[in-house]
């Protein structure tokens, strides 16, 4: 089956959600782990990740179509210490498949705002830290 991973971000007030989405077949969920790393160009693994999600097969989902599983990492208030390069990854302990998403970055600016760049869905997101608006 075709398995892929995408990265996205959303903002709710001061909160920034970093989202790793894995698209897979229902039967491929078992043994899959999705994880998010920061500033780890070569050694991104569940052990070195900021957060990981172990997928479970959901018997409640009918059919054999493609389904998605999401890992969401929420930062309540972005600070300069969050600046860096992030990557969504996934791997299967069963099949040995390893997925690596595109690198994306958080850059905290001197004005107290931050930008998220490198996301495939929207190439450039700019967030006002104080106002909580998306421009």
């Amino acid at each position: 089956g075709c398995i892929n991973i995408t990265s996205s971000a959303s903002q709710e007030g001061t909160r920034l959600n970093l989202i790793c989405t894995v698209w897979h077949k229902k039967e491929e969920a078992e043994g899959f782990v999705v994880f998010l790393c920061k500033d780890r160009s070569g050694d991104c693994s569940p052990e070195t990740s900021l957060k990981q999600l172990r997928l479970k097969r959901d018997p409640g989902i009918d059919g054999v179509g493609e389904i998605s599983s999401q890992l969401m990492f929420t930062i309540s208030q972005v600070t300069p210490l969050h600046s860096g390069t992030y990557q969504c990854c996934a791997r299967s302990q069963k099949s040995g498949i390893r997925l690596q998403g595109h690198f994306f970055s958080i850059l905290f600016t001197e004005t107290g705002n931050y930008t998220v760049t490198g996301l495939k869905q929207r190439q450039h997101l700019e967030f006002s830290h104080n106002e909580g608006t998306l421009s």
């Epitope: 929420t74 309540s76 600070t79 600046s83």
Partner: antibody, heavy 119, light 107 residues
Framework: EVQLVESGGGLVQPGRSLKLSCAAS????????MAWVRQAPTKGLEWVAS????????YYRDSVKGRFTISRDNSKNTQYLQMDSLRSEDTATYYC????????????WGQGASVTVSS | EIVLTQSPTTTAASPGERVTITCRAS?????MHWYQQKPGASPKPWIY???KLASGVPDRFSGSGSGTSYSLTINNMEAEDAATYYC??????????FGAGTKLEIK
């Protein structure tokens, strides 16, 4: 068990230097930004400095800028605070603390290292 | 720089009493965190993001507030709650700011 252990405190004369160390264990040290917070005798808490997870970015309170240097060695799971040109007002217990990644709370604290600056 | 003003500076309460400690910010802040510190010990995170209790904190504690006014409340004071409580916020560029602390004693 997550643990932070400070060392290197002591009595030092004004104008001299001292280096504090903080040994971390029980978590993936290289994933977390770290901080130093101090507390003068019978006084409140005061943030001193912070360092990013990779060590490339450092931040200081104005009163210590140019005198204190925060650094870390991720291969040794240790962070440091080099304190130069010490003043009597730097006398305090210095705590090593871990930044919570998802929040702005300082989630884990060490037991503290006492620094006395006096002639 | 945002200044946090805690009140009262010192207070005493009897077991079972309701206690409220307030923290006022000189400008609006997004969240407030609270720490508990006992004599000779390091501070412990107690309440984070205004209202979330840290692990192991009894549910007689609660936190609330928004903008410039925040509070920590103990519903039924117990002897083990006697400590100094500090509020803390994050703001750019001053980074981490703490209140001066409120010393809570048991009557």
């Amino acid at each position: 068990e997550v643990q932070l252990v400070e060392s290197g405190g002591g009595l030092v004369q004004p104008g001299r230097s001292l280096k504090l160390s903080c040994a971390a264990s029980g978590f993936t040290f290289s994933n977390y930004a770290m901080a130093w917070v101090r507390q003068a005798p019978t006084k409140g808490l005061e943030w001193v400095a912070s360092i990013s997870s990779g060590g490339g970015d450092t931040y200081y309170r104005d009163s210590v800028k140019g005198r204190f240097t925060i650094s870390r060695d991720n291969s040794k799971n240790t962070q440091y605070l080099q304190m130069d040109s010490l003043r009597s007002e730097d006398t305090a217990t210095y705590y090593c603390a871990t930044h919570n990644y998802e929040s702005t709370v300082l989630i884990t604290w060490g037991q503290g290292a006492s620094v006395t600056v006096s002639s | 720089e945002i200044v946090l003003t805690q009140s009262p500076t010192t207070t005493a309460a009897s077991p079972g009493e309701r206690v409220t400690i307030t923290c006022r910010a000189s400008s609006s802040v997004s969240y407030m965190h609270w720490y508990q510190q006992k004599p000779g010990a390091s501070p412990k995170p107690w309440i984070y993001e205004t209202s979330k209790l840290a692990s192991g904190v009894p549910d007689r504690f609660s936190g609330s507030g928004s903008g410039t006014s925040y509070s920590l409340t103990i519903n039924n004071m117990e002897a083990e709650d006697a400590a100094t409580y500090y509020c803390q916020q994050w703001n750019y560029p001053s980074m981490y700011t703490f209140g001066a602390g409120t010393k809570l004693e048991i009557k």
